[in-house]
Structures are given as structure tokens and as C-alpha cells.
């Protein structure tokens, strides 16, 4: 299914990194959650992969095609 890479987008609801202390800006939901279709405005967000929307974070995330890495699946994985 390729590599799953979290997007740096946070939509101002949750922090960009799991280790960031962001209690003041987090929502009342947990980090884990299911996915939904990405909003249409993110159609071209993932370059070499498919977009999915993290429901609890309201953020786009990319599932990279094999051999690609990066938040937007924009880099070739040299170790692939």
C-alpha cells in the first residue's frame, strides 16, 4: 500500500509533530482516527501518492507510491 507519510498541514487544530507540546491548540479528539476523502482542494497535494484526510486532525496526508517518500511523496527513496 506504499508508505504512509503524515502531512505537515495542521489546519490550526493539532500540532505538526507528535512530540510538540500543543495542549493549548489541540481539539478534544485523540490523534488516532479514521480517514475520509481528501477535500477537493487537495487534489494535487500528493505528488506521487494518494491523498487521505485525517478526520480527527482535519489534515491531508499522503500515502506514497512505492519508491517515494516525503510529506507530499515528492522525493525518490534512494534506499528503495
Amino acid at each position: 500500500d506504499g508508505n504512509s507519510t503524515r502531512s505537515p498541514e495542521t489546519n490550526g487544530l493539532l500540532c505538526g509533530d507528535p512530540d510538540e507540546n500543543c495542549a493549548a491548540t489541540t481539539t478534544q479528539s485523540k490523534r488516532k482516527g479514521h480517514f475520509s476523502r481528501c477535500p477537493k482542494q487537495y487534489k494535487h497535494y500528493c505528488i506521487k501518492g494518494r491523498c487521505r484526510f485525517v478526520v480527527t486532525e482535519q489534515t491531508p496526508s499522503c500515502v506514497c507510491d512505492e519508491g517515494y517518500i516525503g510529506a507530499r511523496c515528492e522525493r525518490v527513496d534512494l534506499f528503495y
Epitope: 505537515p8 498541514e9 490550526g12 500540532c15 510538540e20 477535500p39 482535519q58
Partner: antibody, heavy 116, light 106 residues
Framework: QVQLLESGGGLVQPGGSLRLSCAAS????????ISWVRQAPGKGLEWVSY????????NYADSVKGRFTISRDNSKNTLYLQMNSLRAEDTAVYYC?????????WGQGTLVTVSS | DIQMTQSPSSLSASVGDRVTITCRAS??????LGWYQQKPGKAPKLLIY???SLQSGVPSRFSGSGSGTDFTLTISSLQPEDFATYYC????????FGQGTKVEIK
């Protein structure tokens, strides 16, 4: 605490240019998408543009496409909006807001007036 | 472009009243909808995201519902500080706001 402080607004003639800045503090700027949203006097809100955390994914409202350019300098925790070919209908308070789709923190806004 | 239509454009209510504002999208946006409150001379404040999720720090008297094209913001018991203008915003296609609903004191 999270703070966004816009600057650079003022009076400009139609066809002129202006560059707005938004200085961010109180959060890790480089990890967040940021947007510009404007509000004409006595009118509603209009999203203008957003830029992702690295500056590689950008979108604009049709009303400003080709005239406005959004950019950011993560080393300076600053967002910019270069506005060219300004029109009377661009007159508004311009807010920078944290987020790309939803906006949980906003600046106080800077007024741009386009008039001859 | 997706158009967002709010109704009513203004309403008068009293403290303690239950207030309902509706927002209709010109095409389906699933649940990609937020609600904001704005007071005169101030920046907007995010109240609700994903149509029905309460933003952190927002009082529980605010609630949102709906999906597809029809959405509702409800204030269960209006408080003095709730007199303001409310905007819906879709974020499925490029972000667009409704025209606003002004809640005034009766």
C-alpha cells in the same frame, strides 16, 4: 501564546503594489500552513490564499490569481502577501490566519485602501 | 466555485433564547464545514469544525450539525457575549464563506 501581527497596509492608487507581512510567534511557525483572509468594509469574509508549511503547495482565490503572490520565510517566522495591479475592490482589512482549511488563530488585521 | 448561503441574514433574540442559523452549500461538501463568530472590530473566532466538532475552549452551548449541503449552527441558550456575526465556511473546494448572520439584541 499564539500571536499573528500583520503590517504593511495603507493607501495605494489603483494599479499600484503593496507587500503585506505577518509576523508569527508563540508556536512553531514552520510546522503550520498559513492563510490570508480579507474583509471589505462592512462586508463578509473572503479567503485569499494559503501556503503550506514548506512553501511548496499554494492556492489562491480566483479574484486575486495572477495578481497576488503568497510566500513565507520560516527562518524569520514571517508570512508575506505581494499584491500587484491593485483594484478598488481589493480594499479590505487583510488578516493572516493559522491553517489552510480552517483558521484557529487570527491576527488583528491590516487595512489596505485602494483609491485615487 | 461552491457558494455558501446563510439564513437568516440577521435575527433579533433575547438572552436565554435558542438560536438556529442555517447554511446551504451549492453542492455537496460532505462535512467540510466550519463556523466562526466575529464581533465588531475583532478577528473571527473558530467555533465548530467538521460540521459538528466543537473547537477547544468553545462553550458547549454552541453545536453544529448537518452534512452534504445543509448545515446548522445552534446556540442552545443565548448569552450576552454571543451577540455577534456568524459565518459558515466550506473547505471542500477552495475555501469560501457564507455572507454572515448578524445576531442582534431584541
Amino acid at each position: 501564546q499564539v500571536q499573528l501581527l500583520e503590517s504593511g497596509g495603507g493607501l495605494v492608487q489603483p494599479g499600484g503594489s503593496l507587500r503585506l507581512s505577518c509576523a508569527a510567534s508563540g508556536f512553531t511557525f514552520s510546522r503550520y500552513w498559513i492563510s490570508w483572509v480579507r474583509q471589505a468594509p462592512g462586508k463578509g469574509l473572503e479567503w485569499v490564499s494559503y501556503i503550506d508549511s514548506t512553501g511548496t503547495f499554494i492556492n489562491y482565490a480566483d479574484s486575486v490569481k495572477g495578481r497576488f503572490t503568497i510566500s513565507r520565510d520560516n527562518s524569520k517566522n514571517t508570512l508575506y502577501l505581494q499584491m500587484n495591479s491593485l483594484r478598488a475592490e481589493d480594499t479590505a482589512v487583510y488578516y493572516c490566519a493559522r491553517g489552510g482549511s480552517l483558521f484557529d488563530y487570527w491576527g488583528q488585521g491590516t487595512l489596505v485602501t485602494v483609491s485615487s | 466555485d461552491i457558494q455558501m448561503t446563510q439564513s437568516p441574514s440577521s435575527l433579533s433574540a433575547s438572552v436565554g433564547d435558542r438560536v438556529t442559523i442555517t447554511c446551504r452549500a451549492s453542492q455537496g461538501i460532505i462535512s467540510y464545514l466550519g463556523w466562526y463568530q466575529q464581533k465588531p472590530g475583532k478577528a473571527p473566532k473558530l467555533l465548530i469544525y467538521a460540521a459538528s466538532s466543537l473547537q477547544s475552549g468553545v462553550p458547549s452551548r454552541f453545536s453544529g450539525s448537518g452534512s452534504g449541503t445543509d448545515f446548522t449552527l445552534t446556540i442552545s441558550s443565548l448569552q450576552p457575549e454571543d451577540f455577534a456575526t456568524y459565518y459558515c465556511q466550506q473547505y471542500d473546494a477552495l475555501n469560501t464563506f457564507g455572507q454572515g448572520t448578524k445576531v442582534e439584541i431584541k
